[in-house]
């Protein structure tokens, strides 16, 4: 093996090309020079190199870049990407956004991997926020991203790039996401008017108060039971029956399918039956007729 | 789809050429391999050649076959059949664009070429 | 020169039950090798690559793993279509792209 070190008569490559990958492990790594590699990166991915030669070629970059790669090196690495760790991509400084894009297609149609998830994480970072370019191009690539953030990540999200977010993007949003979500939703809708303001901000509104459910229930925005469901319980409790027909419109009906469901389950408890009897659905389970509602909350809040 | 034609009776040594008619992707983006099963056999990869036309062959098969291929068809050349090159020739995809040495996703029926005296 | 040494051929087992194949490579292959199920007349069909993934629209009965020299695939709840010849292949370097010998599977 050690008369195998130097690179034969002939062999030393003078340019990255498709001669290479009929050159054994020990031939690519004898006669590529790193350098040569570094710098004309965006060869290698033309050419249909082993999962083997692969290895050798990441190792020369590994070598010639130990605190981590050049941007330069990194926006061309294409398939050479799948064979880094998510160790190696820490190394990394990536400001570019067409840099990401690039390594993101690489990946494409396969789940988010550590890989990737750190190399956003890498990338967010150095912005400092989530600007609406970058969310553009994450939920393209990733429709789930969003809700993959944790409260505080989105708190670094502007209201500006809300504008980007598309309805699927929430659809595996928890409740404390959309807390944080909504405010920011809500600001940049605000100049809208109310039907199409309503059709931006229905996404969400999981992350709505009381305050801004009675004033849309003002709006006669019929939203839809979907919608009304995924509502914070907190923020239905307070509905009036009024409010919450006002709110659903024709869609009111739907309150009977779901009435042993949250937050619908809780909301009738918190009624009077009189008034439940009102819409006619049949609804059960509201507070009798001449019982006393003491507001507990209201109590503590005092004392 | 991938579609296999031209396998018929030869005797040895008379050169014998394979087509391998491709449809719905193309050959600029995959590469394609030749593998063949000799009757009661196991599979046995011949080559394969890269989008770009570069031919990589098992060590086995350098000499004895010849891979090249059009914008729509891939073709095996036996140079000079042996009774042991007997066998059914499969003409497959790789399994993603960019690589030469992969997994195979998209197989044709096979074609039979039978060489005696 | 490389070798997939593919074990036990045949295996038989009864309906609902599991068999289990082994391939060894004679060398280091990491991760990348590719099980494939072969009926009589017709032409292999991918199952696993990347030793543990399963393929497009294949059940999730089949299961494959390890790495290195070392891949076994298993089939549980075996099912009389589950009768045929499996085999495994390697594609990590051109030294080593190569199938296994096949593991024939019988279902009683």
């Known amino acids: 093996e050690v008369e195998k070190t130097a690179c034969p008569s002939g062999k030393k490559a003078r340019e990255i090309d498709e001669s290479l990958i009929f050159y054994k492990k020990w031939e690519l790594e004898a006669c590529v020079d790193a350098a040569l590699l570094a710098t004309q990166m965006d060869r290698v991915n033309a050419i249909p190199f082993t999962y083997e030669q692969l290895d050798v070629l990441k190792h020369k970059l590994d070598e010639l870049y130990p605190q981590g790669y050049p941007e330069s090196v990194i926006q061309h690495l294409g398939y050479l990407f799948l064979k880094m760790s998510p160790e190696d991509i820490r190394k990394w400084n990536v400001t570019s956004l067409e840099t990401l894009k690039a390594l993101l297609e690489v990946n494409k149609g396969h789940e988010m991997s550590p890989q990737v998830a750190t190399l956003i994480d890498r990338f967010v970072k150095g912005r400092g926020q989530l600007d609406k370019d970058t969310l553009d191009t994450l939920t393209a690539f990733y429709p789930g991203y969003l809700c993959s953030l944790s409260p505080e990540e989105l708190s670094s999200v502007p209201p500006s790039s809300i504008w980007a977010v598309r309805p699927q993007d929430l659809d595996t949003c928890d409740p404390r996401q959309l807390d944080v979500l909504y405010p920011k939703a809500r600001l940049a809708f605000q100049n809208m008017n109310g039907s199409e303001y309503f059709v931006k901000i229905q996404s969400f509104l999981g992350g709505a108060p009381t305050e801004d459910l009675k004033a849309l229930s003002q709006q006669n925005v019929s939203m839809d039971l979907a919608t009304f469901m995924k509502l914070r319980t907190d923020a239905v409790l307070p509905l009036t029956v009024a409010e919450v027909q006002k709110l659903l419109g024709p869609h009111v009906e739907g309150l009977k399918a779901e009435e042993r469901h949250r937050p619908v389950r809780d909301w009738i408890l918190r009624q009077r039956q009189d008034d439940l009897d009102t819409l006619g659905l049949g609804l059960q389970g509201g507070i009798p007729n001449g019982y006393l509602v003491l507001d507990l909350s209201m109590q503590e809040a005092l004392s | 789809s991938v579609e296999e034609s031209g396998g018929r009776l030869v005797t040895p040594g008379t050169p014998l050429t394979l087509t391998c008619t491709v449809s719905?992707?193309?050959?600029?983006?995959?590469?394609m391999g030749w593998v063949r099963q000799a009757p009661g056999e196991g599979l046995e990869w011949i080559g394969t050649i890269s989008t770009g036309g570069i031919t990589y062959y098992a060590s086995w098969a350098k000499g004895r076959f010849t891979i090249s291929k059009t914008s729509t068809t891939v073709d095996l050349k036996i140079t000079s059949p042996t009774t042991e090159d007997t066998a059914t020739y499969f003409c497959?995809?790789?399994?993603?664009?960019?690589?030469?040495?992969?997994?195979?996703?998209?197989w044709g029926q096979g074609t039979l070429v039978t060489v005696s005296s | 020169v490389f070798e997939l040494t593919q074990t036990p051929s045949p295996v038989s087992a009864a309906v609902g039950g599991t068999v289990t194949i082994r391939c060894q490579a004679s060398?280091?292959?990491?991760?990348?090798l590719a099980w494939y199920q072969q009926k009589p007349g017709q032409p292999p069909k991918l199952l696993i690559y990347e030793a543990s993934i399963l393929a497009s629209g294949v059940s999730s009965r089949f299961k494959g793993s390890g790495s290195g020299t070392e891949f076994t695939l298993t089939i549980s709840d075996l099912e009389c279509a589950d009768a045929a010849t499996y085999y495994c292949q390697s594609y990590y370097a051109a030294s080593s792209n190569a199938f296994g010998g096949g593991t024939e599977v019988v279902v009683k």
């Open positions: 060398q280091n292959i990491k991760s990348y």
């Open positions: 497959a995809r790789v399994g993603s664009s960019g690589y030469l040495f992969y997994f195979f996703n998209l």
């Open positions: 719905g992707f193309s050959l600029s983006s995959y590469a």
